[in-house]
């Protein structure tokens, strides 16, 4: 019989008492085969973290800073359940740390040196740890003691709770630096008042502070937020302009064998019976013998943290950077305006080899990082382990939802001004063998399908989106008799046609021979009835253009396109017979890397782009013999995006809407995780 006990860790007598009450009340409402609670008492949160890691306890609820400690080795804990605040309809699990300034003050984030600062309190998250952590490497040396470095960075501050004797500049704007509401500039509202009164130039607070203190929109319009990319935004655009997104209070568990499903089952049942306004005799979010015992008193309920989300992703790049800077106190030798090497994310073995060759030739400008799937690469870019990669539009959508931005677009047509003219896109098509003359768009049911990969534009999002509109369900593996759609569940019929060996079968990378445009076409040639690819795929792999044994004798005339009106046309008539127009592949990165990725890639394409005539002996960035490694092989150049610099603007309203409709069919664990952070 599996043990269905969750050992909850308590950090005080009062918490232990509430835990026992929690245990007893759960017993009275949950059947004997359901989850139960046991209580483990420890002296501190850090002791609880160690106990969970050592399998002496299973769960504890932590503030963000402690979630970071819990994630560090050797603890390796992960977030499993989040408390939410506000309403069930609009649950808030995060708050945003922001830098508020007056509208007419005219300086940016990188010009804070010498300004006057207002903080909620020394050592507090939004008011101190996050802003000072992010500014850490700009502080004058020596950076220890930290208070002294901060005092020398700003021209005056109010940092309640600081030592006014040792660091008088930190109390310059609020004499005495009182650590309670007796100090008018203490806490969130106090720090904002410090700015409002004109004592300070910038206030480090929560996104809600300004709304709580200024009910009138006209008054709020006198203030702006400083963004990390050295721009400003209105105060209501805090989701796109903040220092960090911080989880409020989170239940953590072991990463391996952590009982996360059991913990969720327990807490979900607990909130049903003892949540807000549910029961008089025991209330989960109430602490008669103290404050915030086990859970925050202000919490309204729990949400399950998506399983793909580790602590780094949950806390977010900015928060982790800030806390790591404060804890480790390490900075690059001397901050320079020069760009650090761009860490390119390579998918599996073959891309890694090409990336290594690029790295050797780039002379220190490109480094390589490997991952097994596109989603793993996106996650690595999010958390700073990697910086950039080029993505199909379907993954540009996921990357965008995860906070990344497009920076350059692949262009596929030769033109005089290639780098300045991003193209409208390419065509997604359905290809069949000419010999299968009875096959049309209207009778694909039961046929064998070949896809570039799940989540990609031409191979999945466009054809499956159109199919979904017709069949109104997501069981595509039942619609086709079998197929190869790399990235599908291994036991799905949509992995049956794939050719990868062993663990590589149906993997969404080049270890699966039927992956990508060329792979999907090969799948059609060898096994399938229809392939969903781009309009250039057939000509690029026929007429001897692909020297591989399976392709060298193929003839373009032996293939036709399926049109949406039920007719068929020759391959060259793609402009009048396609499924939809697809946005070109694009390079994505984090916002903080945007300028450097743009600069370095433009240099790199001038050295190794289409201007290189002999690729047999020289490195060519856009060549890999139809394998589309790192970039599509038909890329002519990487083009500036001009104002199409967000994923929505880049992909266009129509495509974003189409992918949004397919979301209900999405199996993307990363998309689920990212929409948890930003619904």
């Amino acid at each position: 019989v599996p043990d269905k006990t969750v050992r909850w860790c308590a950090v005080s007598e009062h918490e232990a008492t509430k835990c026992q009450s929690f245990r007893d009340h759960m017993k009275s409402v949950i059947p004997s085969d359901g989850p139960s609670v046991a209580c483990v008492k420890k002296a501190s949160y850090l002791d609880c973290i160690r106990a969970i890691a050592a399998n002496e306890a299973d769960a504890v609820t932590l503030d963000a800073g402690l979630v970071y400690d819990a994630y560090l080795a050797p603890n390796n804990l992960k977030p499993v359940v989040a408390e939410f605040y506000g309403s069930k309809e609009d649950p808030q699990t995060f708050y945003y740390a922001v830098a508020v300034v007056k509208k007419d003050s005219g300086f940016q984030m990188n010009q804070l040196r010498g300004k006057k600062s207002c903080h909620t309190g020394l050592g507090r998250s939004a008011g101190w740890n996050i802003p000072i952590g992010l500014l850490y490497c700009d502080l004058p040396e020596p950076r220890k003691p930290l208070e002294k470095a901060v005092a020398n960075f700003f021209s005056g501050s109010c940092a309640p709770c600081a030592d006014g004797t040792d660091f008088p500049q930190l109390c310059q704007l609020c004499p005495g630096c009182g650590c309670s509401t007796l100090n008018q500039y203490f806490g969130y509202s106090g720090a904002f008042k410090c700015l409002k009164d004109g004592a300070g130039d910038v206030a480090f607070v929560k996104h809600s502070t300004i709304f709580e203190n200024l009910a009138n929109k006209a008054d709020r319009d006198q203030y702006e937020l400083l963004c990390l990319d050295n721009t400003r935004k209105p105060v209501d655009e805090y989701k796109d302009c903040h220092l960090a997104q911080v989880p409020s209070h989170t239940v953590v568990a072991r990463s391996m064998g952590g009982k996360e499903d059991l913990i969720w089952e327990l807490l979900n049942q607990a909130q049903e019976h003892f949540g807000k306004d549910k029961s008089k005799e025991f209330q989960l979010f109430s602490s008669p013998h103290g404050k915030d015992l086990l859970f925050k008193d202000s919490a309204h309920g729990f949400l399950k943290v998506p399983p793909r989300m580790d602590a780094k992703m949950y806390l977010g790049y900015e928060y982790v950077t800030a806390i790591r800077n404060l804890r480790e106190g390490t900075c690059p030798e001397a901050p320079t305006d020069e760009c650090k090497p761009v860490k390119w994310c390579a998918l599996s073995h073959h891309e890694r080899l090409k990336c290594d060759e690029w790295s050797v030739n780039s002379v220190g400008k490109i480094e390589c990082v490997s991952a097994e799937t596109t989603e793993d690469c996106i996650a690595k870019i999010m958390n700073g382990e990697a910086d950039a990669m080029s993505l199909d539009g379907g993954f540009v959508y996921i990357a965008g939802k995860c906070g990344l931005v497009p920076v350059l677009a692949e262009n596929y047509n030769k033109s005089d001004n290639c780098e300045d003219t991003p193209e409208a896109g390419y065509f997604a098509i359905a290809v069949v063998k000419k010999s299968a003359s009875d096959l049309t768009w209207d009778n694909l049911k039961g046929k064998k399908s070949c896809h570039t990969a799940v989540g990609r534009t031409a191979g999945w999002n466009i054809p499956m989106g159109l199919l979904y509109n017709k069949i109104n369900h997501c069981r595509f593996d039942e619609f086709f008799s079998e197929g190869c759609a790399p990235g599908s569940k291994k036991d799905s019929s949509l992995c049956k046609l794939c050719m990868g060996s062993g663990l590589n079968l149906c993997e969404p990378n080049n270890k699966e021979g039927y992956y990508g445009y060329t792979g999907a076409f090969r799948c059609l040639v060898e096994k399938g009835d229809v392939a969903f690819v781009k309009h250039q795929t057939v000509p690029q792999n026929t007429g001897g253009k692909n020297p591989d044994p399976w392709a060298k004798n193929l003839n373009e005339k032996d293939y036709e396109l399926l049109c949406l009106d039920g007719t068929r046309k020759p391959v060259e008539e793609y402009a009048n017979c396609h499924l939809a127009r697809a946005p070109n592949h694009a390079v994505v990165t984090r916002k903080d890397k945007e300028a450097c990725v743009h600069k370095i890639l433009r240099q790199q394409q001038h050295l190794f782009g289409s201007n290189v005539t002999d690729c047999s002996g020289n490195f060519c960035l856009f060549r890999s013999e139809t394998k589309d490694l790192l970039f599509r092989d038909d890329t002519v150049c990487l083009a500036k995006l001009h104002d199409r610099n967000t994923y929505e603007k880049y992909l266009g309203e129509e495509y974003v809407k189409a992918v949004g409709n397919l979301r209900k069919c999405s199996t993307s664990s990363l998309l689920e995780a990212c929409t948890f952070r930003r619904p």
Partner: nanobody, 117 residues
């Protein structure tokens, strides 16, 4: 396709040195990038050092300051001088010319380097 043959491996004590050679069956003068990789048991193959035709080099962080890559186009050979060897340098070392534009698995036999006391 140029064939590459690696040699020079062996058993050496920590702190010792070895010089690996990679002899090509044809001219390497027109080949831009040559590189040494290594693969330890149960690990992924990783880039150790690379050199371009112009003599620009790149090294893995773990070997910087200890290993030196060089090429002699006249002798159609690429070398890897390995000093101050450590137990974690134990692996099979392979040479590549990246000449297959689609980066398939065309590796030679490699040469075994074992660093142990």
């Amino acid at each position: 396709q140029v064939q590459l043959v690696e040699s020079g491996g062996g058993l050496v004590q920590p702190g010792g040195s070895l010089r690996l050679s990679c002899a090509a069956s044809g001219s390497i003068a027109s080949i831009n990038t040559m590189a040494w990789y290594r693969q330890a048991p149960g690990k992924q193959r990783e880039l150790v050092a690379g050199i371009t035709s112009g003599g620009s080099t790149k090294y893995a962080d773990s070997v910087k300051g200890r290993f030196t890559i060089s090429r002699d186009n006249a002798k159609n050979t690429v070398y890897l001088q390995m000093n101050n060897l450590k137990p974690e340098d134990t692996a099979i070392y392979y040479c590549t010319d990246y000449s297959k534009r689609y980066y398939q698995d065309y590796w030679g036999q490699g040469t075994q380097v074992t660093v142990s006391s």
